[in-house]
Interface confidence: low
């Protein structure tokens, strides 16, 4: 599996989305995991509703919520107010029984507030004097990582 | 998908009002800072203010050449951006935009003309 | 305010080739974090401008890469290498340095 990167601004919400076959996947719940070291195991963090057909509806454990549109084959996986400790590598996941399928290697990376001009921590708007606790970046900027690349969360 | 949809636009007498609205779907609304953007027709966007998110009160910045006479405002609820416009001058007609903002305005909505004329 | 300042285009590109948009701003958009806070937008007719590159060079989400930015400070080039039909609208350069946002002019391409 190639991993895709996904940038989310601290503070705001990142959607991760996992796309999957939908037939291949027919009846399977989905899970997001975070991955605790390079081949350390994949630490569960949100789960789809115990029962499949209900998969549409979101769940939350803490800020983390999953949805799963089980006819068109999306995963999809919110991060709420985004934190530099939440970069990292996590896992798509589809169930079935106790093991589980990858769909997706996920490299989450967590920015700056894009309105930050400054080096400080302080989150700021432009022409401001006064710092403000800004975050604004549902963009979900993805690409995959090639091959060799090291994954360098520009976090701040 | 992210989706902004004005309305409100129309003609209005110099000195008038009016009250423009922008719909916003597919994001979290209350997370992000919102601006609205005029373009005179045939020319380039002037950028008119911005109100921030919840998280910073909704508070709101102007540029110099509406302030006092434009007031930008937002129903949460209803996920809503709004932008009262009073005192119009000829020069105020234009196609009015609201944009989301980001590392720039990543998102805009189709827009709305206002025609300011007697 | 930032003053941007666009060049125009001297003749329609012809289709395949590379087209290259200019702008100026009136003060550095370099700042000391290493950012260049400059944006480009493309509007196509009879549509809403829709976001290219930020921070000089980065493409946005979903903009294809034929499209790329670069520059100093002040000086700003925006290049579409082997250009189509789609790319046909006015082009403008945004500061995102300080208050107000401020647009350049815009520049229109046109193919052959």
């Known amino acids: 599996h190639n991993t895709t990167v996904f940038q989310g601004v601290a503070g705001q919400s990142l959607q991760v989305s996992c796309p999957y076959d939908s037939m291949k996947h027919w009846g399977r719940r989905k899970a997001w995991c975070r991955q605790l070291g390079e081949k350390g195991p994949c630490q569960r963090v949100v789960s789809t509703h115990n029962l499949w057909l209900l998969s549409f509806l979101r769940r939350w454990n803490g800020s983390t919520a999953i949805t799963d549109d089980t006819l068109g084959g999306t995963l999809t996986i919110t991060l709420r107010n985004l934190q530099p400790h939440d970069a990292g590598l996590y896992q798509c996941q589809s169930l079935h029984g106790s093991e589980a399928d990858t769909l997706r290697k996920v490299l989450v990376e967590v920015l700056a507030d894009p309105l930050d001009h400054r080096d400080a921590g302080d989150l700021w708007f432009p022409g401001e004097s006064e710092s403000f606790e800004d975050a604004h970046v549902e963009h979900s900027i993805s690409r995959s990582l090639l091959e060799g690349e090291i994954p360098f969360p520009p976090t701040s | 998908e992210v989706k902004l949809l004005e309305s409100g636009g129309g003609l209005v007498q110099p000195g008038g009002s009016l009250r423009l609205s922008c719909a916003a779907s597919?994001?979290?609304?209350?997370?992000?800072?919102m601006s609205w953007i005029r373009q005179p027709p045939g020319k380039a966007p002037e950028w008119l203010g911005v109100?921030?998110?919840?998280?910073?009160?909704?508070?709101?910045e102007y540029n110099t050449s509406v302030k006092g006479r434009f007031t930008i405002s937002r129903d949460y609820t209803q996920n809503i951006l709004h932008l009262q416009t009073n005192t119009l001058r000829a020069e105020d007609t234009a196609i009015y935009y609201c944009?989301?903002?980001?590392?720039?305005?990543?998102?805009w909505g189709q827009g709305v003309m206002v025609t300011v004329s007697s | 305010d930032i003053v941007m300042t666009q060049g125009a285009l001297p003749n329609p590109v012809p289709s395949g080739e590379s087209a290259s948009i200019t702008c100026q701003s009136s003060?550095?958009?370099?700042?000391?974090?290493?950012?260049?806070?400059l944006n480009w937008y493309l509007q196509r007719p009879g549509q809403s401008p829709q976001f290219l590159i930020y921070?000089?060079?980065t493409r946005a989400s979903g903009v294809s890469d034929r499209f790329s930015g670069s520059g100093s400070g002040t000086d700003f080039t925006l290049k579409i290498s082997s250009v189509e039909a789609e790319d046909v609208g006015v082009y403008y350069c945004?500061?995102?340095?300080?208050?107000?946002?401020?647009f350049g002019s815009g520049t229109k391409l046109e193919i052959k």
């Open positions: 109100i921030r998110n919840k998280a910073n009160g909704f508070t709101t």
């Open positions: 921070w000089m060079s």
């Open positions: 945004q500061q995102f340095l300080e208050l107000p946002f401020t």
């Open positions: 944009a989301r903002l980001t590392y720039g305005f990543d998102y």
């Open positions: 003060k550095s958009l370099l700042h000391s974090n290493g950012k260049t806070y």
């Open positions: 597919g994001f979290t609304f209350t997370d992000f800072y």
